[in-house]
Interface confidence: medium
């Protein structure tokens, strides 16, 4: 619900937001030689232009197109890892398995990860006091529209076998309302993507249930199958051991670390 005074239900723009975005951009372009020619000042200008002086409940994907253009990046389309409600483990994984990429391993995802931002209609100010909450205020806010835009593009770019890490500790292992469930699943391209492989991450040490049989996973399988994409599922019973085995795959105790349950 738009308010006359810009007092929103969500936290305000992250402190030192402009400096953070610029610094992250410089750092990213230093670390990734293929992106070293991105002009970070232009990236920041495009980012700012997407939401400054605009009503924070009236942001569109179109607003972010200049930024999307500047941040265009080619990642290996068959090395994409999606995730839902288990970001930290997904990032730990790609830090070890350097040839796989989450959205936050791309420039635009890296820039915005864990940040909040919004502006005010007709002023050039950044609102550090409050920003719209997706549920309580509006869904077309700067942060939500950004992630919807970059997530859609990321999913559209995927090919061959796409992996997704899901949190087995949550009541809804697959949540239709998550970014993965509402955006990425529906933007995988059946003509390019052969299989979606879900990795269900177990939380409890003694948890030996087959979470690939969970009703929400069946729901995911149904959605994916209807889109002419094959589906497979694996239980990751011990995420700590899983990461160890990614680091040291030759370890003899690692052969049966991932338990397969294929569904076609």
């Amino acid at each position: 619900v738009p308010r006359w005074r810009q007092q929103w239900s969500g936290p305000g723009t992250t402190k030192r937001f402009p400096e953070t975005v610029l610094a992250r951009c410089v750092k990213y372009t230093e670390i990734h030689p293929e992106m070293r020619h991105v002009d970070c000042q232009s990236v920041w200008d495009a980012f700012k232009g997407a939401f400054i002086s605009k009503h924070p409940c009236n942001i569109t994907e179109e607003d972010y197109q200049p930024l999307m253009k500047l941040g265009t990046q080619t990642v290996p389309c068959n090395k994409i890892l999606l995730w839902s409600r288990i970001k930290d483990l997904a990032h730990q994984f790609t830090q070890v398995q350097r040839d796989m990429f989450t959205l936050e391993d791309t420039l635009l995802g890296y820039l915005a990860d864990d940040l909040t931002w919004c502006g005010e209609f007709n002023t050039s100010k950044i609102n550090y006091q409050s920003c719209p909450d997706w549920r309580k205020d509006c869904s077309n806010n700067p942060v939500s529209v950004f992630w919807k835009t970059v997530s859609r593009r990321f999913a559209e770019a995927a090919c061959d076998v796409v992996h997704v890490m899901l949190n087995g500790s949550r009541s809804k292992i697959f949540d239709k309302n998550s970014t993965f469930g509402s955006v990425e699943v529906h933007n995988l391209q059946p003509e390019k993507v052969q299989t979606l492989e879900a990795w269900v991450i177990h939380g409890g040490r003694e948890d030996s249930r087959d979470l690939c049989q969970d009703p929400t996973i069946k729901e995911l399988e149904s959605i994916i199958s209807k889109r002419n994409i094959q589906f497979s599922c694996k239980n990751i019973y011990r995420p700590d051991k899983f990461l160890q085995c990614v680091k040291n795959p030759e370890d003899s105790s690692c052969t049966s670390e991932i338990h397969h349950h294929h569904h076609h």
């Epitope: 410089v26 750092k27 670390i31 070293r36 020619h37 970070c40």
Partner: antibody
Framework: EVQLVESGGGLVQPGGSLRLSCAAS????????MHWVRQAPGKGLEWVAF????????YYADTVKGRFTISRDNAKSSLFLQMTSLRAEDTAVYSC?????????????WGQGTTVTVSS | DIVMTQSPDSLAVSLGERATINCRAS??????????MHWYQQKPGQPPKLLIY???NLESGIPDRFSGSGSRTDFTLTISSLQAEDVATYYC?????????FGGGTKVEIK
């Protein structure tokens, strides 16, 4: 005020080693990539090496690769260039330079330089 | 490596007159719609000073009589009205590809 002060230059025999230092002040050193650039007597400028803010990316000119090592100590706001297997053609004034904040590969501040002479 | 060729090697211009320095790259230095070409001024006994970055952007604190233009392989530094303090050697530099490379320099003097 941004200041870059090089030290460690001198006369060294061919095949010898030298370690150059660059002391930085007037800015947050750990936020910037840094370069070494050299200028041979009466000649133009030649880029030598680059190190990113957190030392995660390092690049060298082919002419020095395998012989020179760039490093930094962010806690001490210092940049270093370890030079080994020195040759006569390495004779030059060596300057450290700060990478421009918003894009890799050009320099917004330079030090005065320290002279390295390789001769027998 | 990208070879940067500056012309002329030296230039004598009357005070208040226009000075033009050219720089040609052996291959395209444009990327992402941006020209990765930069210009520096070096006075005797001093380190170089950044004048122009990315072909046409004036570095802060640099007088606006300095300007840069060009794209792809051909670039120009112009001093619209030469002042005595502009006597120096001017270098172009590309950052589109490693190694970073400089032109040989153009010495500007008063006629």
């Amino acid at each position: 005020e941004v200041q870059l002060v090089e030290s460690g230059g001198g006369l060294v025999q061919p095949g010898g080693s030298l370690r150059l230092s660059c002391a930085a002040s007037g800015f947050t050193f750990s936020d910037y990539g840094m370069h070494w650039v050299r200028q041979a007597p009466g000649k133009g400028l030649e880029w030598v090496a680059f190190i990113s803010s957190g030392s995660s990316s390092i690049y060298y000119a082919d002419t020095v690769k395998g012989r020179f090592t760039i490093s930094r100590d962010n806690a001490k706001s210092s940049l270093f260039l370890q030079m080994t297997s020195l040759r006569a053609e390495d004779t030059a004034v060596y300057s450290c330079a700060r990478n421009y904040v918003s894009s890799y590969g050009y320099f917004d501040y330079w030090g005065q330089g320290t002279t390295v002479t390789v001769s027998s | 490596d990208i070879v940067m060729t500056q012309s002329p090697d030296s230039l004598a211009v009357s005070l208040g007159e226009r000075a033009t320095i050219n720089c040609r790259a052996s291959e395209n230095v444009d990327n992402y719609g941006i020209s990765f070409m930069h210009w520096y001024q070096q006075k005797p006994g001093q380190p170089p000073k950044l004048l122009i970055y990315r072909a046409s952007n004036l570095e802060s604190g640099i007088p606006d009589r300095f300007s840069g233009s060009g794209s792809r392989t051909d670039f120009t530094l112009t001093i619209s009205s030469l002042q005595a303090e502009d006597v120096a050697t001017y270098y172009c530099q590309q950052s589109n590809k490693d190694p970073l490379t400089f032109g040989g320099g153009t010495k500007v003097e008063i006629k």
